[in-house]
């Protein structure tokens, strides 16, 4: 009987078994971002490629309007990398002028939105001060962890400054999730 | 019946079930790199420890000649960390001389090679400008994501400068993949 | 028969199948650290939230006294992110004074302890020189990889300086593991 241990003496029934290839999965890749109005005090969300190149969604995991839609409850591994690039950060210019120097920063947040609850939940945050002296700087922030998600939850990736995101290559900036 | 939900009313048959312990998996760790000729405009590939210490390959996932060989089609989580270390980057020396300062950089790429297609595919890239003022610097770049791979695909890790890779400890620089 | 491929012609028996939802899993999040005595030449271990907010342990994966306890043998994906923050690093002060400048560093180690042997095994290390010029700096170190663990193994996260760990938000500093 499926879901029963080999040893028949103690009938230990698990949840229904299911093939791994049937699990919701998505890997989304960066596209050029269109400037959008975002709420004050809230980081803007990135939108993503979901079907071309390395990007895909499968088994009822859908992407729509910056969100990955969670089709069934369970434990998911969720990950993202955002590569940032910019010119000399403000911090080094301020420093050279001899004024107090709160460094610039770059931040990535993976956020969960649940329709039944108005406040988004920050699942993962990667935040880094940027005080580069060189004229052009670039660097990635990587995040990944496991979360218990509910059917209907929506995931998005927010960044501190959308204009600093490197959207040139699908391997540099990406976002994914898969049911464990 | 295996592959059928418990509720017999709607006979939902999945792909064949298989035990998780039977899935192709590998975790490779750093070894000292031997200088090799690499193609111009192509980053050199690292070679790896595959059987000693924390390194292993199992269930038909094999390592040969810098490549992880994918033994069956499916969705894989692929990851790598490379720790780089070096002396003061050129960029800071140039800066001190008051000249334009394009920063040095360090880059890791996880690349897929398919025999039937001549051009490698870059799956993941982590790239960072290095403009360190201190005399000795060191830092890791971590990458990880899910990809749909085909039987026969080969994975490798390329770096911008093999001489900057920290090969001293198996926990600092590594490369792995597992079938989901 | 459970554990047998659909094609009955060659009876290929795997290990017993089991539902994914039954697998040991944990995601732990940061809490404020209490200063503790730690052994000389050994990085201090962090302690963690295991049941509030985003944190959980399930299916016999337990957390106790800074350790995640591995309840069954198998291949696990283990991950952690530690966000560090501090004031201007010593290195830049030394540099300004014109003396040799060995940079400060921040380090995260995921360590395995096996009761049968007193010497811990370092599974993963992320280490980074810190030579920031700005007065306040902050940055994450992320680690994640797959390891073969035995029932009874214990995992912990060690850091080079506990006072630099950002314990303010559960999404910034975390530690997890799940059976594949």
């Amino acid at each position: 009987l499926k879901g029963q241990e080999f040893a028949p003496s103690h009938q230990q029934v698990y949840a229904p078994l299911r093939a791994d290839g049937d699990k919701p999965r998505a890997h989304l890749t960066v596209v050029r971002q269109t400037p959008t109005q975002h709420l004050k005090n809230q980081f803007p969300a990135l939108h993503w490629e979901h079907e071309l190149g390395l990007a895909f969604t499968k088994n009822r995991m859908n992407y729509t309007n910056k969100f990955l839609l969670i089709p069934e409850s369970g434990d998911y591994f969720v990950y993202s990398q955002v590569t940032f690039r910019g010119m000399t950060s403000e911090c080094s210019e301020i420093r050279q002028a001899g004024r107090p120097n709160k460094p610039d920063s770059i931040t990535v947040v993976i956020t969960k939105v649940t329709d039944s609850y108005p406040e988004p939940t920050q699942l993962l945050m990667g935040t880094k001060s940027v005080c580069e002296v060189g004229s052009n700087w670039f660097q990635p922030i990587y995040l990944g962890a496991m979360f218990s998600l509910q059917e209907g939850d929506k995931l998005m990736v927010n960044v501190s400054d959308i204009s600093l995101v490197d959207y040139t290559k699908e391997d540099k900036t990406f976002f994914g999730a898969f049911l464990l | 019946l295996k592959g059928q939900e418990f509720a017999p009313s709607h006979q939902q048959v999945y792909a064949p079930l298989r035990a998780d312990g039977d899935k192709p998996r590998a975790h490779l760790t750093v070894v000292r790199q031997t200088p090799t000729q690499h193609l111009k405009n192509q980053f050199p590939a690292l070679h790896w420890e595959h059987e000693l210490g924390l390194a292993f390959t199992k269930n038909r996932m094999n390592y040969t000649n810098k490549f992880l060989l994918i033994p069956e089609s499916g969705d894989y989580f692929v990851y790598s960390q490379v720790t780089f270390r070096g002396m003061t980057s050129e960029c800071s020396e140039i800066r001190q001389a008051g000249r334009p300062n394009k920063p040095d950089s360090i880059t890791v790429v996880i690349t897929k090679v398919t025999d039937s297609y001549p051009e490698p595919t870059q799956l993941l890239m982590g790239t960072k400008s290095v403009c360190e003022v201190g005399s000795n610097w060191f830092q890791p770049i971590y990458l990880g994501a899910m990809f749909s791979l085909q039987e026969g695909d080969k994975l490798m890790v390329n770096v911008s400068d093999i001489s900057l890779v920290d090969y001293t400890k198996e926990d600092k620089t590594f490369f792995g993949a597992f079938l989901l | 028969l459970k554990g047998q491929e659909f094609a009955p012609s060659h009876q290929q028996v795997y290990a017993p199948l089991r539902a994914d939802g039954d697998k040991p899993r944990a995601h732990l999040t940061v809490v404020r650290q209490t200063p503790t005595q730690h052994l000389k030449n050994q990085f201090p271990a962090l302690h963690w939230e295991h049941e509030l907010g985003l944190a959980f342990t399930k299916n016999r994966m337990n957390y106790t006294n800074k350790f995640l306890l591995i309840p069954e043998s198998g291949d696990y994906f283990v991950y952690s992110q530690v966000t560090f923050r501090g004031m201007t690093s010593e290195c830049s002060e030394i540099r300004q004074a014109g003396r040799p400048n060995k940079p400060d560093s921040i380090t995260v180690v995921i360590t395995k302890v096996t009761d049968s042997y007193p010497e811990p095994t370092q599974l993963l290390m992320g280490t980074k020189s810190v030579c920031e010029v700005g007065s306040n700096w902050f940055q994450p170190i992320y680690l994640g990889a797959m390891f073969s663990l035995q029932e009874g193994d214990k995992l912990m996260v060690n850091v080079s300086d506990i006072s630099l760990v950002d314990y303010t938000k559960e999404d910034k500093t975390f530690f997890g593991a799940f059976l594949l």
Partner: antibody
């Protein structure tokens, strides 16, 4: 201190099998890979294969594949080498020997087990 | 497989004399080690990774080489150095040993 203690000498008939044990102490058993090396009387060292107790992974010298089986019992820090279908030219001293990483060489050796194959 | 050829097979040397043993590989090797084996004893690691002295080994022993050609040198032979010396490569499986060089004290 590190010790690898092997089982005692064996006399076997051609066609039989022999299983040699090697108990490790004084170091992390799963942290080192166990090799098996043999030396026929007056002859050179010959590498049979290795087993990594951490992962259970094995690698055999093709010459011994199908005849040698390497196993470990991590709960008692013991490695085993079984050689089947013994021939007279398998008469040798069999050593277990552990290595950490390949640049370290084989640092620890057992005392050896003499296996004599004779009809 | 990589074949390691040691020379000489045998050397009879007076104490305080310098001994040089060579190990030639049939293809390039990254990891070469040297072992000493005395009669009725297990081998003992002498030189690891071409040139690094193993723990407790006297400084009169040294190793050098790269690629396919490696050398073990005993700078000033002592009576206790009478033994057979083996090279071993850890670059490519199977991890082969050289044929051995027996060093005898005159």
């Amino acid at each position: 201190q590190v010790q690898l203690v092997q089982s005692g000498a064996e006399v076997k008939k051609p066609g039989a099998s022999v299983k040699v044990s090697c108990k490790a102490s004084g170091y992390s058993f799963t942290g080192y890979t166990m090799n098996w090396v043999r030396q026929a009387p007056g002859q050179n060292l010959e590498w049979i294969g290795l087993i990594n107790p951490y992962s259970g992974g094995t690698n055999y010298n093709q010459k011994f594949k199908g005849r040698a089986t390497l196993t470990v019992d991590t709960s008692i820090s013991t490695a085993y080498m079984e050689l089947s279908r013994l021939r007279s030219d398998d008469t040798a001293v069999y050593y277990c020997a552990s290595i950490y990483q390949r640049h370290d060489g084989i640092a620890y050796w057992g005392q050896g087990t003499l296996v004599t194959v004779s009809s | 497989e990589i074949v390691l050829t040691q020379s000489p097979d045998f050397q009879s040397v007076t104490p305080k004399e310098k001994v040089t043993i060579t190990c030639s590989a049939s293809s390039s090797v990254n990891y070469m080690h040297w072992y000493q084996q005395k009669p009725d004893q297990s081998p003992k690691l002498l030189i690891k990774d071409t040139s690094k002295l193993a723990s407790g080994v006297p400084s009169r022993f040294s190793g050098s080489g790269s690629g396919t050609d490696f050398t073990l040198t005993i700078n000033s032979l002592e009576a206790e150095d009478a033994a057979t010396y083996y090279c071993q490569q850890w670059s490519s499986s199977p991890y082969t040993f050289g044929g051995g060089t027996k060093v005898e004290i005159k």
